[in-house]
């Protein structure tokens, strides 16, 4: 039996700059019912103050509601582990809610085969916006990315797509069913998981219809 | 603690190219974006770019681009930084570095001197 | 990119006085989100430099508080209250709002 191994702070993500959560790696207990408690303070403030909410977000966490986040500070967050041996403590994390986006996958995927006056074929590919990103007013900056492959493939093709939400996809096979999602990424953040995936068998025969 | 341990030197021929590297320890590597810094001897500091250990992502100072690329080895956690065709206005102490959940430096390698000389 | 100017490049004290650094940028460090990324990093002779001051005024973990900075916009300050021998080293200054990210030439803080 002993004090408890020092914890770590491994992750806090934030969808949409409004809540936000860190998660921590507890560390060895010492063989003993051990205590973890998240405390925090912001920049230029002295008061310290306990995670709000370690419910939400699962175990080894702490979610920080509308309430309690603000882009404007920097957190600086430690976790502490106590048990009757003793106690330790995670290094600080410097936390600025802007570099820890982690935004919902674009949504409304359609896609589409459509035909050049010169008869080659393409798939045009559209999607939006996640929903809780307020994209119009710049508060996000959002660059995507659209993945596809053929059922039969084993690898997927990467297109970077910048700020556009579409993108013209050339020389499919005709005959073959391809998959394709799309993720997205705020200015200085993290991409999203892959979206939803959807389907599309280009035709053998297209022809274009009026 | 977290430690960031690079190797002290580096003696290359101009026109080749070397792989610098950088072990992570003390901390979940695929967590935290990983910088590298150029320092020329007696100058300024100048920002190479950063990697996301997490998927590999990279954003280069445009300066750099051709110059240096990027990679990790996460099973190892390791950073590396490849650079080619040297010169020897590449001969400089390297750093690798960590920010927190920012964008500034917390945490730095000791750095190491890449010496471009025939 | 943002050029950062920073002045004097070399700077004589006497033990016990206030020093002061001053940072100049090239344009606006002001972040689309409202903060100003300007932060100041101390380096000594053969080691890896060490971050004083971030976000122009919050002095780093450990840091001691005879050192401050201040300025908004594109002008910034670090002054050291009263300089102790450990102080005498190299000043860099740092922004971050911009990519890519660019650093001042450096001050070395001296003995008069």
């Known amino acids: 039996q002993s004090p408890p191994g020092k914890p770590e702070i491994h992750k806090c993500r934030s969808p949409d700059k409004e809540t936000f959560t860190c998660w921590w790696n507890p560390g060895s207990d010492g063989g003993l019912p051990t205590n973890y408690s998240l405390t925090y303070s912001k920049e230029g403030e002295k008061n310290t103050y306990e995670c709000p909410d370690y419910k939400t977000s699962g175990p080894n966490s702490c979610f920080f509601s509308k309430q309690y986040t603000s882009i404007w500070k920097i957190y600086i967050i430690t976790v502490n582990a106590t048990n009757e041996m003793g106690s330790s403590t995670s290094d600080p994390l410097y936390v600025d809610v802007t570099y820890i986006v982690e935004p919902e996958p674009p949504r409304n995927l359609t896609l589409e085969v459509k035909q050049l006056k010169d008869k080659k074929t393409y798939l045009w590919v559209k999607w939006l916006p996640p929903t809780i990103t307020d994209v119009k007013t710049g508060w996000f900056t959002m660059e995507y990315e659209i993945r596809l492959k053929s059922e039969e493939a084993d690898e997927w093709e990467i297109h970077f797509t910048g700020h556009q939400t579409q993108f013209k996809v050339f020389d499919l096979y005709p005959g073959q069913k391809y998959l394709v999602q799309t993720r997205c990424k705020p200015d200085h953040g993290y991409w999203s998981r892959w979206g939803q995936e959807k389907s599309i068998e280009i035709p053998n025969d297209f022809t274009l219809k009026d | 603690q977290v430690q960031l341990q690079q190797p002290g030197a580096e003696l290359v021929r101009p026109g080749t190219s070397v792989k610098l590297s950088c072990k992570a320890s003390?901390?979940?590597?695929?967590?935290?974006?990983m910088h590298w810094v150029k320092q020329r001897p007696g100058q300024g500091l100048e920002w190479i770019g950063v990697i996301d250990p997490s998927d590999s992502h990279t954003n280069y100072n445009q300066k750099f681009k051709g110059k240096a690329t990027l990679t990790v080895n996460t099973s190892s956690s390791t950073a590396y930084m490849h650079l080619s065709s040297l010169t020897s206005e590449d001969s400089a102490v390297y750093y690798c570095?960590?920010?927190?959940?920012?964008?500034?430096?917390?945490?730095w390698g000791q750095g190491t001197l890449v010496t471009v000389s025939a | 990119d943002v050029v950062m100017t920073q002045t004097p490049f070399s700077l004589p004290v006497s033990l016990g006085d206030q020093a002061s650094i001053s940072c100049r940028s090239s344009q606006s460090l002001v972040h689309s989100n409202g903060n100003t990324y300007l932060h100041w990093y101390l380096q000594k002779p053969g080691q890896s430099p060490k971050l004083l001051i971030y976000?122009?005024?919050n002095r780093f973990s450990g840091v001691p508080d005879r050192f401050s900075g201040s300025g908004s916009g594109t002008d910034f300050t670090l002054k050291i209250s009263r300089v102790e021998a450990e102080d005498l080293e190299l000043y860099f200054c740092s922004q971050s709002t911009h990519v890519p990210w660019t650093f001042g030439g450096g001050t070395k803080l001296e003995i008069k």
């Open positions: 570095a960590r920010g927190d959940y920012s964008n500034w430096f917390t945490y």
């Open positions: 976000k122009v005024s």
């Open positions: 003390g901390y979940t590597f695929t967590s935290f974006w």
